[in-house]
């Protein structure tokens, strides 16, 4: 039985060429966490293996840095940046927990932080 | 020298599921620190990388067919399988599976089973 | 999904020719891209990975060149073995995807 939540950032707003952390907590489980891929509608950015560490897509590596801890760091934001992101933790015994973030990456400077929620 | 070996049937019916297991001997999928892939080539046609597995179990899939595969991992018996569901025709292909170098780049898909021809007809 | 074009569909050539064979992406993959060596009834074979590096026990004839968007296979002087079909790989962003394809055939 899946018990484990996914506690995310939200939805996060940052702007223009600046940089943002993409941020997935999993808790109420005591699964060992084997894997998290990071993804961005149909592309994958980056996997952090429990065994192998952290490999990021060649596509991404200029704008893509690994953590802080299971994280993402997002840099040089473009608008094009703009949409959802999810976070896969592969876990066992439990099996898969995915949390939802939604970037939206703005012209102006002022770029506020949503609130966090969670992912049952 | 290691070597896979691809299982499974041969034909399978429009909307059922498709289960292939691959056999691999000549090493440890648990201590080799690879992923473990399946890649398919409709007959005539190129090649298209379906999903790869750790022996953990983590996986990561091509999104075109995310919604259908599920690929698992049993050390120990060294296999891996895959199954694709609500197949049609446009599955029937040669199924390969062959170990994945996603942390080791040079490797690419340096080692391949021989290939097993599924057919999906009523 | 970066998509990988092979020119020509077909080489007809003679042993002891030189074969050039071109793969062309969609939009950049740096350097990540390989090329697969396939004979009838036989899985792919890798040839060369990141764009000009021989895999293991691979004969010199073979080499890789190019980066960006345009890539060359050459066979410096085809062995009869080397008549088989060609895919350059892309690995730059996910999904990997092939190329359709090159078919070198005796002429």
């Known amino acids: 039985m899946m018990t484990g939540t996914i506690e995310t950032t939200g939805n996060i707003s940052a702007e223009k060429g600046g940089s943002i952390i993409l941020q997935c907590h999993l808790s109420s489980t005591t699964a060992q966490v084997t894997q998290v891929n990071w993804e961005q509608q149909d592309q994958l950015l980056a996997i952090c293996n429990a065994d192998l560490g952290w490999h990021i897509s060649p596509s991404f590596k200029d704008r893509v840095a690994p953590g802080p801890g299971l994280g993402l760091t997002l840099q040089s934001l473009t608008v094009n940046d703009t949409g959802e992101y999810f976070c896969i933790y592969h876990t066992y015994p439990d099996g898969t927990y995915t949390g939802r973030i939604f970037l939206e990456v703005l012209e102006s400077s002022v770029a506020e932080h949503g609130a966090r929620f969670q992912i049952p | 020298q290691l070597q896979l070996q691809e299982s499974g049937p041969g034909l399978v019916k429009p909307s059922e599921t498709l289960s292939l297991t691959c056999t691999v001997s000549g090493g440890s999928i648990s201590s080799s620190r690879y992923y473990w892939g399946w890649i398919r080539q409709p007959p005539g046609k190129g090649l298209e990388w379906i999903g790869s597995i750790y022996y953990s179990g983590s996986t990561y899939y091509n999104p075109s067919l995310k919604s259908r595969v599920t690929i698992s991992v049993d050390t120990s018996k060294n296999q891996f399988s895959l199954k694709l569901s609500s197949v049609t025709a446009a599955d029937t292909a040669v199924y390969y599976c062959?170990?994945?170098?996603?942390?080791?780049?040079?490797?690419?898909?340096?080692?391949w089973g021989q290939g097993t021809l599924v057919t999906v007809s009523s | 999904e970066i998509v990988l074009t092979q020119s020509p569909a077909t080489l007809s050539l003679s042993p002891g020719e030189r074969a050039t064979l071109s793969c062309r992406a969609s939009q950049s993959v740096s350097s990540y891209l390989a090329w697969y060596q396939q004979k009838p009834g036989q899985a792919p074979r890798l040839l060369i990975y990141?764009?000009?590096n021989r895999a293991t026990g691979i004969p010199a004839r073979f080499s890789g060149s190019g980066s960006g968007t345009d890539f060359t296979l050459t066979i410096s002087s085809l062995e009869p073995e080397d008549f088989a079909v060609y895919y350059c790989q892309q690995r730059f962003a996910h999904p990997y995807t092939f190329g359709g394809g090159t078919k070198v055939e005796i002429k």
């Open positions: 062959a170990r994945d170098g996603l942390y080791h780049t040079p490797e690419y898909f340096q080692h």
């Open positions: 990141d764009a000009s």
